[in-house]
C-alpha cells in the first residue's frame, strides 16, 4: 500500500517517499522506484537554507550601496547575505532593505543608547543637575560644574541645556 506520509527530510511524490535535497542544493529530478533523488549544488551567489525540493536556488540579497547598505556577512550556498548599514546609518526594517541616518539628540537631551547598524539612537531628557548644549548622536547629558569644589559660587543656575555659571565668593547679593 502506498504511503500517505513520509519521514523527516522526505517528501511524497507519485505515491512514494523521496529524499529532500540538503541545504545548499536544489532538486534536479525526483526519485523513482529505482533511483535516488537527484540534487545539484547552488551556483555562485545563490543559496537554499533548508532541506528542500526547490528546482531553483534563491539569489543572494544585494546590499545596494546607493541605499546605504553594505555586506555584514557574505552569503554561502546555505545562507543568504546579511546586509547592514554604513557608519552613521541604521536599517529601516528588520530585513534591512534600506538605511536612514541616525537621529541626533537635541539640546536638553542626551544619548541613552548609541545607534547601531540596526537600531536608532535612543535619547533621554537631561534631568536636573545635568545638561546637553549640543545636537549629537553620541553625547550623553553632562553634569553641571560643581562651583563649590572650585571654591566658587553659582552666579547663574544651570538648565537642561546650559551649565552652571560659577563666580567668585564675594559676588553675594
Amino acid at each position: 500500500e502506498p504511503p500517505t506520509a513520509c519521514r523527516e527530510k522526505q517528501y511524497l511524490i507519485n505515491s512514494q517517499c523521496c529524499s529532500l535535497c540538503q541545504p545548499g542544493q536544489k532538486l534536479v529530478s525526483d526519485c523513482t522506484e529505482f533511483t535516488e533523488t537527484e540534487c545539484l549544488p547552488c551556483g555562485e551567489s545563490e543559496f537554499l537554507d533548508t532541506w528542500n525540493r526547490e528546482t531553483r536556488c534563491h539569489q543572494h540579497k544585494y546590499c545596494d550601496p546607493n541605499l546605504g547598505l553594505r555586506v555584514q556577512q557574505k552569503g554561502t550556498s546555505e545562507t543568504d547575505t546579511i546586509c547592514t548599514c554604513e557608519e552613521g546609518l541604521h536599517c529601516t526594517s528588520e530585513s534591512c532593505e534600506s538605511c536612514v541616518p541616525h537621529r541626533s539628540c537635541l539640546p536638553g537631551f542626551g544619548v541613552k543608547q548609541i545607534a547601531t547598524g540596526v537600531s536608532d539612537t535612543i535619547c533621554e531628557p537631561c534631568p536636573v543637575g545635568f545638561f546637553s548644549n549640543v545636537s549629537s548622536a553620541f553625547e550623553k547629558c553632562r553634569p553641571w560644574t560643581s562651583c563649590e569644589t572650585k571654591d566658587l559660587v553659582v552666579q547663574q543656575a544651570g538648565t537642561n541645556k546650559t551649565d552652571v555659571v560659577c563666580g567668585p565668593q564675594d559676588r553675594q547679593r
Partner: antibody
Framework: QVQLVQSGAEVKKPGSSVKVSCKAS????????IEWIRQAPGQGLEWMGS????????NYAQKFQGRVTITADTSTSTAYMELSSLRSEDTAVYYC???????????????WGQGTLVTVSS | DIQMTQSPSSVSASVGDRVTITCRAS????????????LAWYQQKPGKAPKLLIY???SLQSGVPSRFSGSGSGTDFTLTISSLQPEDFATYYC?????????FGQGTKVEIK
C-alpha cells in the same frame, strides 16, 4: 538645626497682592534652593517656583509665570514669594521648603516651613 | 510636564496592616547615567507641613521608621508601610524631581478602617 519660619496668615481682597516671607536658619542659605509650594483647602500640593538665593536664579511653574515673583535677601536669610492679581482660587496654605544645597543630588524637599494661610475674599 | 498619578486615592486599613501605595509617572524617572530614580514620598497630617519619607525612590530619610520603604524604577513606584501604626494615618504624596516643573501625585489618604 535647619529651620524655615514663615510669616503669619493674611486676608486679601481679589485683585490685590500678597507677599509671604520665609526666614531660614541652621544652614548656608545662599547656596540652597528655596522652593515654594501651595495647597488649596482639601486639595493636593502644587509647586509654584524656586530661587537660588546667592545668584537670584529662579524657576517658575508656567501656571504662575507673570503673576508670581520669588526673591531672596541673603543678608537676612529670608526668601519671599509675592503673588499678584489674587483671585478666590488662590486661597491656600503657602509653604516654603529647602531644595538642593549645591551638591546637585538633593532636589527633594527635606525641610518645610510651617505654612502661611492666605485667604482671598471680598 | 511630567504627570504623576497615585492610586488608590484613599485606603482604609487597620493597625498592623501592610499598606501599598503606587505612583505612576508619565515618563521615565530613571536616568541612565547615574541609574537614579528622581522620586520622593512625603507624609502629611492635617494642619501640618508635609514630611519627607523617601528620596531617590528607595532611600529612607533620616529619622523615618524602617516600616516605610520605597521601590520601583522607570515609571512605576511603590510606597509600602509594612505594619501600619496609629501615627501613620495621614495623606501620602509622591513627587518627581527629574526636571522642572516639579509635580506631585494627587495624594493617597490612609484612613482607619
Amino acid at each position: 538645626q535647619v529651620q524655615l519660619v514663615q510669616s503669619g496668615a493674611e486676608v486679601k481682597k481679589p485683585g490685590s497682592s500678597v507677599k509671604v516671607s520665609c526666614k531660614a536658619s541652621g544652614y548656608t542659605f545662599s547656596t540652597s534652593w528655596i522652593e515654594w509650594i501651595r495647597q488649596a483647602p482639601g486639595q493636593g500640593l502644587e509647586w509654584m517656583g524656586s530661587i537660588l538665593p546667592g545668584s537670584g536664579s529662579t524657576n517658575y511653574a508656567q501656571k504662575f509665570q507673570g503673576r508670581v515673583t520669588i526673591t531672596a535677601d541673603t543678608s537676612t536669610s529670608t526668601a519671599y514669594m509675592e503673588l499678584s492679581s489674587l483671585r478666590s482660587e488662590d486661597t491656600a496654605v503657602y509653604y516654603c521648603a529647602r531644595g538642593d544645597d549645591g551638591s546637585y543630588v538633593r532636589w527633594y524637599f527635606d525641610h518645610w516651613g510651617q505654612g502661611t494661610l492666605v485667604t482671598v475674599s471680598s | 510636564d511630567i504627570q504623576m498619578t497615585q492610586s488608590p486615592s484613599s485606603v482604609s486599613a487597620s493597625v498592623g496592616d501592610r499598606v501599598t501605595i503606587t505612583c505612576r509617572a508619565s515618563q521615565s524617572l530613571t536616568f541612565s547615567v547615574n541609574q537614579k530614580n528622581y522620586l520622593a514620598w512625603y507624609q502629611q497630617k492635617p494642619g501640618k507641613a508635609p514630611k519627607l519619607l523617601i528620596y531617590w525612590a528607595s532611600s529612607l530619610q533620616s529619622g523615618v521608621p524602617s516600616r516605610f520603604s520605597g521601590s520601583g524604577s522607570g515609571t512605576d513606584f511603590t510606597l509600602t508601610i509594612s505594619s501600619l501604626q496609629p501615627e501613620d494615618f495621614a495623606t501620602y504624596y509622591c513627587q518627581h524631581y527629574y526636571s522642572y516643573p516639579w509635580t506631585f501625585g494627587q495624594g493617597t489618604k490612609v484612613e482607619i478602617k
